[in-house]
Interface confidence: low
């Protein structure tokens, strides 16, 4: 689905647009990007309020609101493989347009540690509550969605567009309509600030086509950091109204002539600008000529000024703007140096954390430390990484290779391990035989025994029922007939399931001794898996029961 711009708020040097439509975070970012912006940042309480205002504007226009919990993507994301950092306000997330880790955050709830997949942040609006300024939208973290599945409950997204500066809205001195078209393709008739390079169409008159006049203006940079429309005098003036309509469109004072004409004027200490509408202070610093955080310092007698930069910044060639000093040029850090506005910070590569001797030093993170291990069973710390391993009878599983899954040796890729019945257990397996056969000393083959109508041998003895440490849900053993003894027909789907009675003798040969579980498990009837081939009892290759064991040292775990 597409996305419609429904609302726009311009303030300072940025405009925020709110869009409705079920898109993934990537699609939303692409949408913002096409018009020269990014998914919005929320780097301060003030910015959170601007974003909330544009959402309030959007929601006011939504005809039918079905969701009572609405989510809107913002530009806060964490890449796959980058772990949560609870010590930071942004918890290891970063803004899509780049920029430093900001101090403001407003998380909805404590974040779950997960490094497996990319995670994205949306603003969570509880529409069941009145949308009050004091109740800023919470940050909700989750999957980023995909084109087919845009993300649960995502209603839309917020874009941010940054500009060199803004023009004041055009003031009309009589009836008329202004339509602004912004560089990010939004049209609006009411903006509290109008971004640089926007066009303004002014249609004067009260709707009577014969009287309508049209004007076209462009918000231009008239001088460094001074933006205006290049219009002179109030627009749509009418002798019928004089100063009575919108103060004649004047910024401060409006003076009427006897013929219905009027002029704009300014209060003491202010001067009229070239547009003949706006007033500016006579103090040279009041027009804020200094940029980039520079402070304007008045010269003697209040005639001229100089710009002064804060620590970590220096004046550029214009002597008006402050530029950041790049402290990283001096390589002050052991691993990564991030230049920040007015300073720098040292960062460590993934798998390392700040620490060790010296400023900006890094030390290996022991992911396998007690209470921290991401692995279900074995964990080996390496320099800057780790890898997981599993005990015998288990293999690595899970998207990130941190879980262990029981190997069903009875259906293993190496073919059947037992000559007759195979019982899979957690981390191991046992062989058994059909009635009339007994398990050979090798624990795999079956030999003809005394005639008996007893059950197949196989259920583990009490001491063999222990489960591997780290295993999760115990599974019932499954009995799989593999090769039937020579001369006996192979099991068919009609074969009645052998019953296990408590008084029948049971033989089993555990291939691997396991620690007892402490409490005996309930023995479950084995299920019969039908074999594909029937041949006489055979010794496994090498005549060694080691074929039944399985070990996996694992692969690298993910950070």
């Amino acid at each position: 689905t597409g996305a419609d711009t429904e609302a726009v708020v311009c303030v300072g040097t940025a405009c925020y647009t709110a869009h409705s439509g079920k898109l993934s975070a990537a699609e939303a970012q692409n949408h913002c990007n096409q018009n020269g912006g990014n998914l919005a940042t929320v780097k301060s309480k003030e910015e959170a309020q601007h974003v909330q205002r544009v959402l309030a504007q959007l929601l006011r226009r939504e005809a039918a609101l079905t969701a009572r919990m609405s989510k809107f993507w913002i530009g806060l994301q964490r890449e796959k493989g980058k772990c949560l950092d609870p010590s930071l306000p942004l918890k290891g997330f970063s803004w899509v347009g780049g920029g430093e880790d900001t101090p403001y955050s407003n998380w909805h709830k404590e974040l779950r540690n997960s490094c497996i997949s990319k995670r994205c942040v949306s603003l969570l609006l509880d529409l069941s509550q009145p949308l009050l300024p004091s109740r800023l939208p919470k940050w909700s973290e989750g999957p980023c969605g995909s084109p087919g599945s845009p993300g649960s409950n995502i209603e839309g997204f917020v874009c941010k567009f940054s500009f060199k500066g803004m023009c004041r809205p055009l003031a009309l001195g009589g009836p008329g309509q202004v339509t602004y078209t912004t560089p990010f393709q939004t049209t609006s008739s009411s903006l509290e600030a109008v971004p640089f390079a926007s066009a303004a169409n002014v249609a004067c008159g009260e709707g009577d086509k014969d009287e309508t006049q049209s004007h076209y203006f462009l918000c231009k940079e008239k001088a460094p950091d001074v933006f205006d429309w290049g219009s002179s005098g109030p627009l749509c003036v009418s002798p019928k109204y004089g100063c009575n309509f919108n103060n004649g469109g004047c910024h401060q004072d409006c003076f009427e002539g006897g013929d219905g004409s009027f002029l704009c004027g300014c209060r003491p200490g202010f001067r009229l600008l070239d547009d003949l509408v706006t007033c500016a202070s006579r103090n040279p610093c009041s027009s804020s000529p200094c940029r980039g955080g520079a402070t304007c310092v008045l010269g003697p007698h209040g005639k001229n000024y100089t710009c002064r930069c804060p620590q970590g910044y220096q004046l550029d060639s214009s002597q008006l703007d402050c530029v950041d000093v790049d402290e990283c040029q001096d390589s002050p850090c052991a691993q990564e140096c991030v230049n920040t506005p007015g300073g720098f910070r040292c960062e460590c590569w993934v798998g390392y954390e700040p620490g060790g001797p010296g400023e900006g030093a890094c030390q290996d993170v022991d992911e396998c430390a007690l209470g921290r291990s991401p692995c279900a069973q074995g964990c080996t710390n390496t320099d800057g990484s780790f890898h997981c391993s599993c005990e015998e009878g288990y293999v690595l599983a899970g998207e990130d290779g941190t879980q262990c899954q029981d190997v069903d040796e009875c259906v293993g890729p190496g073919g059947p391990l037992c000559d007759s019945l195979c019982f899979n257990t957690q981390g191991s397996f046992h062989c058994g035989c059909l009635p009339g056969w007994v398990l050979a000393p090798n624990g795999v083959s079956c030999t003809m025994g005394p005639v008996s109508l007893g059950p197949p041998s196989g259920p583990p003895d009490e001491e063999d029922k222990g489960e591997k440490e780290g295993s999760t849900v115990p599974r019932a053993a499954t009995a799989s007939p593999t090769r039937g003894p020579e001369g006996t027909p192979k099991a068919t789907p009609t074969t009645s399931r052998p019953s296990l009675s408590s008084d029948a003798p049971i033989t089993s040969a555990p291939l691997k001794m396991l620690a007892p579980s402490g409490s005996p498990g309930v023995w479950r009837e084995p299920s019969i898996h039908h074999a594909t081939a029937a041949s006489g009892p055979q010794e496994p290759a090498g005549g060694d029961s080691s074929v039944a064991t399985q070990n996996n040292d694992g692969t690298d775990g993910q950070k």
Epitope: V11, E46, Q49, H50, Q52, R53, A56, Q57, L59, R60, A63, L65, R68, S128, Q129, P130, L131, L132, P133, S134, E192
Partner: antibody, heavy 120, light 111 residues
Framework: QVQLVQSGAEVKKPGASVKVSCKAS????????MHWVRQAPGQGLEWMGE????????YYNQKFKGRVTMTRDKSISTAYMELNSLTSDDSAVYYC?????????????WGAGTTVTVSS | DIVMTQSPDSLAVSLGERATINCKAS??????????LNWYQQKPGQPPKLLIY???NLESGVPDRFSGSGSGTDFTLTISSLQAEDVAVYYC?????????FGGGTKVEIK
């Protein structure tokens, strides 16, 4: 035109409950919050709470929490305000008023008011 | 709760003269550039009527002799030329915080 029509005057004994209704017409009932405001004789205005007729969510002034219940019947575009454990201090004119859904929730349309008298 | 204090309690103004009512909030009712402050007019035996919302926006159908100004904690309602039908009690209201609170009212009479 947009109208909020309230139920008639009520006389109640202390300890009793009162339920006032407010029928909306001329606009989409579920697109605006409905508020209740009361005014004691010769006194100012006091906001009691609001209900979202769309989903029946309520938001009460803490002063009345536990005593007030706001409900609505979408099928007949009517909002209700019930106040329990009445005392003589609850004698007032009770107004319903609608507000926009988001942002500055000013009350642009008011009912004519329902006079509730609590007397033994 | 935000306390709204109106002054004066009552005001007597001659017909055609200017009437000014003040409203002070115990804390700022501004939010991201908007003032969440509204003015209502109440005539005897009638419900309140919205005059101005967001400090300075005139509600449609309200005569333009009414105007509002102010921001933060200090707000003013001005009637530029008092008419006989303007005799009423005027209330300010903040909608920036819960609970939404009203001022005590200012009674405007003709001198």
């Amino acid at each position: 035109q947009v109208q909020l029509v309230q139920s008639g005057a009520e006389v109640k004994k202390p300890g009793a409950s009162v339920k006032v209704s407010c029928k909306a017409s001329g606009y989409t009932f579920t697109s605006y919050w409905m508020h209740w405001v009361r005014q004691a004789p010769g006194q100012g205005l006091e906001w009691m709470g609001e209900i979202d007729p769309s989903a029946s969510y309520t938001y009460y002034n803490q002063k009345f929490k536990g005593r007030v219940t706001m409900t609505r019947d979408k099928s007949i575009s009517t909002a209700y305000m019930e106040l329990n454990s009445l005392t003589s201090d609850d004698s007032a004119v009770y107004y319903c008023a609608r507000s926009v859904y988001y942002g500055n929730k000013y009350f642009d349309v008011w009912g004519a008011g329902t006079t509730v008298t609590v007397s033994s | 709760d935000i306390v709204m204090t109106q002054s004066p309690d009552s005001l007597a103004v001659s017909l055609g003269e200017r009437a000014t009512i003040n409203c002070k909030a115990s804390q700022s009712v501004d939010y991201a550039g908007d003032s969440y402050l509204n003015w209502y007019q109440q005539k005897p035996g009638q419900p309140p009527k919205l005059l101005i919302y967001a400090a300075s926006n005139l509600e449609s159908g309200v005569p333009d002799r009414f105007s509002g100004s102010g921001s933060g904690t200090d707000f003013t309602l001005t009637i530029s030329s008092l008419q006989a039908e303007d005799v009423a009690v005027y209330y300010c209201q903040q909608t920036n915080e819960d609970p939404r609170t009203f001022g005590g009212g200012t009674k405007v009479e003709i001198k």
